[in-house]
């Protein structure tokens, strides 16, 4: 008796699903009866299939209403975890184990990744200095690094501070400042660059015309 | 090749506690596995005492030794730890830490002895 | 709580015998359960786990069976190093446990 399992890694964006397989032998008809699956995630229960159906009292909370195992699927002999609107703490190493007759378990891993897509900017000017000052914060996971260009494509270095958000969710709260002597209509751009994976996403920051919010002059560096 | 090595063995008072220690190499303790405490008595058998979890060290113990065990583990070390209390004569034995794999213990240390007496 | 029981307790055989040792569950249970052997003065090595398949490394005359409540472990032909006492022992997810049977040694003849 031996579980396939068709990927042992699975890599997924915060918020989306995840379909994780194993599979098992089947001849004929399944009987459910004689089938348990335990789907479990190190200390947590994810699912329980025995006597013919999913018992809901073992599974941890954090996956309440969010983990299935679609019968449809079990009777052709595929045990699949389905996980709605995956959280980062979901990531992890996950070990399907059935018991049909004979018995296996494998181990998959799970990796959750929060791409920091949507950038918020503001820019602001010390009219004392003519300075200004550009802001680049996203959230996402797993940490970024935030490289500043101008229009030349040449580096500037700004300042990222990176703390946790205080959500339920973890993110990353990464916010990125750079100060430069510019003038209106000058084109910046920050980009948020995850470093393992080498995803990155951009921003562009265009110095308006206008006056601009005006920032307090007891600005500490 | 994965190698465990407990340390923290020898002669306590009844009454007292234990904290061993169960040194890894060739595998982080961080990483995909778990990590039991088994004891043995001295001509007697296997006892699982608990296990804990790689990332978010969560722990599961066995009903007769809930609330006076502790498994913990120093990521940094590679190390596991179990701490029992108010020990008894009976607690006397064979102390081994193993890896787990999905449904048993895959890799043993070579054990340490415990004995409880005044 | 499940218990399991192994028999014999005890056993003598020769080198070459086939050896079976059985384990009992109190009550029906998902074959996650694997057998250990231990010999003296050492640490259990896993041998058989999920009732049949053949830990990495171990040889090929020890095999596993069973379902249910009755699970077996055979040695095809006893060898010299097979002297040793074994144990069977059983996984349950919630509560989360594991439990072990109480051991067979197997004796020279």
């Known amino acids: 008796f031996t579980i396939t399992a068709p990927k042992d890694l699975y890599v997924v964006e915060y918020g989306s699903n995840v379909t994780m397989e194993c599979r098992f032998p089947v001849e004929q008809k399944l009987d459910l009866l004689a089938l348990v699956v335990y789907w479990e995630k190190e200390d947590k229960e994810v699912i329980q299939f025995v006597e013919g159906e999913e018992d809901l009292k073992p599974q941890h909370s954090s996956f309440r209403g969010r983990a299935f195992l679609p019968k449809d699927q079990l009777l052709k002999g595929n045990a699949v975890l389905q996980i709605t609107d995956v959280k980062l703490q979901d990531a992890g190493v996950y070990c399907c184990m059935i018991s049909y007759g004979g018995a296996d378990y494998k181990r998959i891993t799970l990796k959750v990744n929060a791409p920091y897509r949507k950038i918020n900017q503001r820019i602001s000017m010390d009219p004392a200095t003519s300075e200004h000052e550009l802001m680049c914060q996203a959230e996402g996971y797993p940490e970024a690094e935030v490289i500043w260009t101008n229009s030349d494509h040449q580096s500037l270095s700004g300042e990222t501070t990176v703390t946790t958000s205080q959500t339920e969710e973890k993110l990353l709260n990464v916010t990125s400042v750079l100060r430069v002597n510019a003038t209106a209509n000058d084109v910046f751009h920050c980009t948020f660059w995850r470093v393992h994976s080498g995803e990155n996403h951009t921003a562009e920051l265009i110095i308006p015309e206008l006056p601009v919010p005006r920032l307090p002059h007891n600005r500490t560096h | 090749e994965v190698q465990l090595v407990e340390s923290g063995g020898g002669l306590v008072q009844p009454g007292g506690s234990l904290r061993l220690s169960c040194a890894a190499s060739?595998?982080?303790?961080?990483?995909?596995?778990?990590w039991g405490w088994i004891r043995q008595a001295p001509g007697k058998g296997l006892e699982w005492i608990g296990i804990?979890?790689?990332?978010?060290?969560?722990?599961n113990y066995a009903q007769k030794f809930q609330g006076r065990v502790t498994i913990s583990r120093d990521n940094s070390k590679n190390t596991l730890y179990l701490q029992l209390n108010s020990l008894r004569a009976e607690d006397t034995a064979v102390y081994y830490c193993?890896?787990?794999?999905?449904?048993?213990?895959?890799?043993w240390g070579q054990g340490t002895l415990v004995t409880v007496s005044s | 709580d499940i218990q399991l029981t192994q028999s014999p307790s005890s056993l003598s055989a020769s080198v070459g015998d086939r050896v079976t040792i059985t384990c009992r569950a109190s009550?029906?249970?998902?074959?996650?359960l694997n057998w250990y052997q231990q010999k003296p003065g050492k640490a259990p090595k896993l041998l058989i786990y999920?009732?049949?398949s053949l830990q990495s490394g171990v040889p090929s005359r020890f095999s596993g069976s069973g379902s249910g409540t009755d699970f077996t472990l055979t040695i095809s032909s006893l060898q010299p190093e097979d002297f040793a006492t074994y144990y069977c022992?059983?996984?349950?997810?919630?509560?989360?446990?594991?439990?072990f049977g109480q051991g067979t040694k197997v004796e020279i003849k």
């Open positions: 999920a009732a049949s």
């Open positions: 022992q059983h996984y349950i997810s919630w509560p989360r446990q594991f439990t």
């Open positions: 804990i979890y790689p990332s978010g060290g969560g722990t």
């Open positions: 009550q029906s249970i998902p074959s996650f």
């Open positions: 060739g595998y982080s303790i961080s990483s995909g596995y778990y």
């Open positions: 193993a890896r787990g794999g999905g449904l048993g213990f895959d890799y």
